[in-house]
Interface confidence: medium
């Protein structure tokens, strides 16, 4: 086993150089020192080592730094970053934005989305701020990575990043994430007025409370049905027929095609049928006339 073999006499290297290319794999394993590799990472990247040799170097570094690489090494990783896994990165402590940006450049176009996201999460966890330069450095990676961050990490994401989020980016976000992102979006768009505000905020409305939706309904926003369907059920069921009518405007016509699907169905169940009938859309599923809702989940008839 390579692990048991001793380094042959005279083979122990004192610096990283081309001679190491001609070492056998077991010799690299036996002779190369992890701290030396860490000090001369720039040379590790310059010399054309094979994939196998670089994997051995990584193994040596991992043994030298079992608790995760120090930031001094991370700063020097360069192209070696491609050999690092997201699991490795989660052990790191990264505080320098320049380090993050440099490594994001290395990962660009290399099918390294998971590593890039882990790196940014690690940086945020250390109290770093995700700025627009960093988001641009993340390049083509959809901003759905915001949903992968812990809620604590999300607090470190500045509101300005919300300008870059697209409608599909939040599809897999948890309700808690959406709530936090909605608050950030409100803060980001606070100086935007009228319809432009609605166009920006609608991506985040899955995190809006019933109070927020009521306020929005006062502004003739004419919400489209796709946005309406993304609202959280708990917020939606608190709205009256009149409020939904104001919120959707002419798009109220689209409720009919969604009446048997959540969240529209859930909302219908909480409305009085007579109020739904007034809409003239033929919507069914409301509380029958003469019934009284005594419990949030149970309907009781008058006896």
């Amino acid at each position: 086993d390579a692990e048991q073999k001793a380094c042959p006499p005279g083979k122990e290297p004192y610096k990283v150089d081309e001679d190491l290319i001609f070492y056998q794999n077991w010799e690299l394993e036996a002779c190369v020192d992890g701290t030396m590799l860490a000090r001369q990472m720039d040379l590790v990247n310059e010399i054309p080592f094979t994939y196998e040799q670089l994997s051995i170097f990584k193994h040596k570094l991992d043994k030298t730094y079992p608790q995760g690489y120090p930031e001094s090494l991370i700063q020097q990783l360069g192209h070696f970053f491609r050999y690092v896994s997201p699991e490795d990165i989660h052990q790191w402590n990264v505080t320098s934005p320049d380090t993050v940006k440099t490594l994001l450049k290395v990962s660009k176009g290399q099918k390294m989305n998971a590593q890039a996201i882990a790196l940014v999460a690690c940086y945020l966890r250390g109290g770093g701020q995700l700025d627009e330069d960093m988001v641009k450095a993340l390049g083509d990676i959809p901003l759905s990575y915001l949903c992968d961050f812990s809620p604590q990490d999300l607090h470190s994401v500045p509101s300005s990043v919300m300008w870059l989020v697209g409608p599909q980016d939040l599809d897999k976000c948890s309700q808690r994430h959406l709530g936090l992102l909605y608050q950030k979006a409100c803060s980001a768009f606070q100086n935007v007025s009228g319809l432009e505000y609605f166009e920006k905020i609608k991506t985040f409305l899955g995190g809006a409370s019933v109070k927020d939706l009521r306020a929005l309904s006062q502004h003739n926003v004419s919400m489209d049905i796709a946005t309406f369907k993304r609202l959280q059920v708990d917020s939606l069921v608190g709205l009256s027929v009149a409020e939904v009518q104001k919120l959707l405007g002419p798009n109220i016509v689209d409720l009919k095609t969604e009446e048997d699907k959540s969240p529209v169905r859930d909302w219908l169940f909480r409305q009085h049928q007579k109020d739904l009938d007034r809409l003239g859309l033929g919507l069914q599923g409301g509380i029958p006339n003469g019934y009284l809702v005594l419990d949030f989940n149970v309907r009781e008839a008058f006896s």
Epitope: E199, P250, N251, V253
Partner: nanobody, 119 residues
Framework: QVQLVESGGGLVQAGGSLRLSCAAS????????MAWFRQAPGKEREIVAV????????YYAESVKGRFTISRDNPKNTVYLQMNSLKPEDTAVYYC????????????WGQGTQVTVSS
């Protein structure tokens, strides 16, 4: 780009009828929801009626329910508003509108047609 042209407006006695048409050109509107809005002098523009893209669902403002009917002919790229039992308060400029998403975004508007109902 969608161009919408309304026609059929005019002067009519109270209790009379008119049929407005809205012809779309430039691109098919068969996947768009279509609506009629109106604006009376000194008032805000208001929804009159909407028909969804399939034609299977319609919505009417409370003030016109039972009197106005919206319909569409997708092959002809046209939407209609049949107005019966007209009242003086129906006097306004009537606008046709088309949208695929939200009425605040990517909404195409016609130039409007004047409807005047005299008593």
């Amino acid at each position: 780009q969608v161009q919408l042209v309304e026609s059929g407006g005019g002067l009519v006695q109270a209790g009379g009828s008119l049929r407005l048409s809205c012809a779309a050109s430039g691109r098919t509107v068969s996947t768009y929801n279509m609506a009629w809005f109106r604006q009376a002098p000194g008032k805000e523009r208001e929804i009159v009626a909407v028909i969804n893209w399939t034609g299977g669902s319609t919505y009417y403002a409370e003030s016109v329910k039972g009197r106005f009917t919206i319909s569409r002919d997708n092959p002809k790229n046209t939407v209609y508003l049949q107005m019966n039992s007209l009242k003086p308060e129906d006097t306004a400029v009537y606008y046709c509108a088309a949208t695929r998403t939200s009425w605040t975004e990517n909404t195409y508007w016609g130039q409007g047609t004047q409807v005047t109902v005299s008593s």
